[in-house]
Amino acid sequence: AVNGTSQFTCFYNSRANISCVWSQDGALQDTSCQVHAWPDRRRWNQTCELLPVSQASWACNLILGAPDSQKLTTVDIVTLRVLCREGVRWRVMAIQDFKPFENLRLMAPISLQVVHVETHRCNISWEISQASHYFERHLEFEARTLSPGHTWEEAPLLTLKQKQEWICLETLTPDTQYEFQVRVKPLQGEFTTWSPWSQPLAFRTKPAALGKDT
């Protein structure tokens, strides 16, 4: 038997993936647990095996189809259950009626590249991955630049309040190594959260031109 409080949190990537984390305070012996997804309007159902990510939390990804296929809509509700094996039967440990488009977390932006770099500025572009057509242009981005001698946590956040897949970084120091990250969030959904940060893009500004003798 399992005692203690349980937390079951899931996010939809807007296409064909629901990622879930289940936390359980009480001790679980070597028990096999899984998440089961049962949509209210669709023919498919899906299961994934919960794997430990810490002493008291487990995670898994429900793969609903090909990465870019649209498997759920704004009208769908998915019953999500955590099931743990207890002897010969499965016990329901947690359950939620999951509204996918109220609980969005997109994939991290990809394909970051330097479009143009100068001494004091750098133009960077990126792409969004596996994002639903439902959003049209209703997305926002946050970006941050890592300067020498600083941490990511210290980097100021730059907010782009529209679907703009590029940025021009200004007031940079010449001949300096920087790193850049970006994340994305749909405007839709009560419990929607930011995507993970993209992989960092490293770039170096151009050296300042040498001053001429007078």
Partner: antibody
């Protein structure tokens, strides 16, 4: 096997109400949405709304301007559709259908005639 | 509301012919498109769900394809019992909407 059996034909006067029933069998009634669709004589199909028997949640087509109410009786596995303030252009065959990635099973239809 | 435009509205074909009906949505509906058959005086039958899924018991001569806004329904070899009206329907968003129908006749 899955079956949806609807109530018989009705003749109503303008301004009256009609309540059509749809009795389900052969599956777990509370696990699938039931939609109501109508078809005027010689015309196309219009989705009226749907209801989830497990919770009673409903969605209605705004074009029906609050004249429609969908209910269920889980004890008899029956869905109901009531349409109020009937007009002559409400004359149609009314269908219930189970939703499961499309409307996979349909009732036989109920003809509602609105005539003075 | 999403408008569904079906074409042609009617067509005549011979037994054994390949028959194609198209359906266009007024906005992107991904693959949330279904096809139905209605014979005169009868109720509707689901043939194809989610663009290309063949419903249980439906003969394999029926197929569907497409994505986004443009969809196609095909009968690979027309049989006499296929005489009916065919409808497309989107279940991408409420209110669900249907095409106006394609009436299929035998030459």
């Amino acid at each position: 096997q899955v079956q949806l059996v609807q109530s018989g034909a009705e003749v109503k006067k303008p301004g009256a109400s009609v309540k059509v029933s749809c009795k389900a069998s052969g599956y777990t009634f509370t696990s699938h949405w039931i939609s109501w669709v109508r078809q005027a004589p010689g015309q196309g199909l219009e989705w009226m709304g749907d209801i989830y028997p497990g919770s009673g949640n409903t969605n209605y087509n705004e074009k029906l301007q609050g004249r429609v109410t969908m209910t269920v009786d889980t004890s008899t596995s029956t869905a109901y559709m009531e349409l109020r303030s009937l007009r002559s252009d409400d004359t149609a065959v009314y269908y219930c259908a189970r939703e499961r990635g499309g409307f996979d099973y349909w009732g036989q239809g109920t003809l509602v005639t609105v005539s003075s | 509301d999403i408008q569904m435009t079906q074409s042609p509205s009617s067509l005549s074909a011979s037994v054994g012919d390949r028959v194609t009906i198209t359906c266009q949505a007024s906005q992107d509906i991904s693959n949330f498109l279904n096809w139905y058959q209605q014979k005169p005086g009868k109720t509707l039958k689901l043939l194809i769900y989610y663009t290309s899924g063949l419903h249980t018991g439906v003969p394999s001569r029926f197929s569907g394809s497409g994505s986004g806004t443009d969809f196609t329904f095909t009968i690979s070899s027309l049989q006499p019992e296929d005489i009916a009206t065919y409808y497309c329907q989107q279940d991408n968003n409420h209110p669900y909407t249907f095409g106006q129908g394609t009436k299929l006749e035998i030459k």
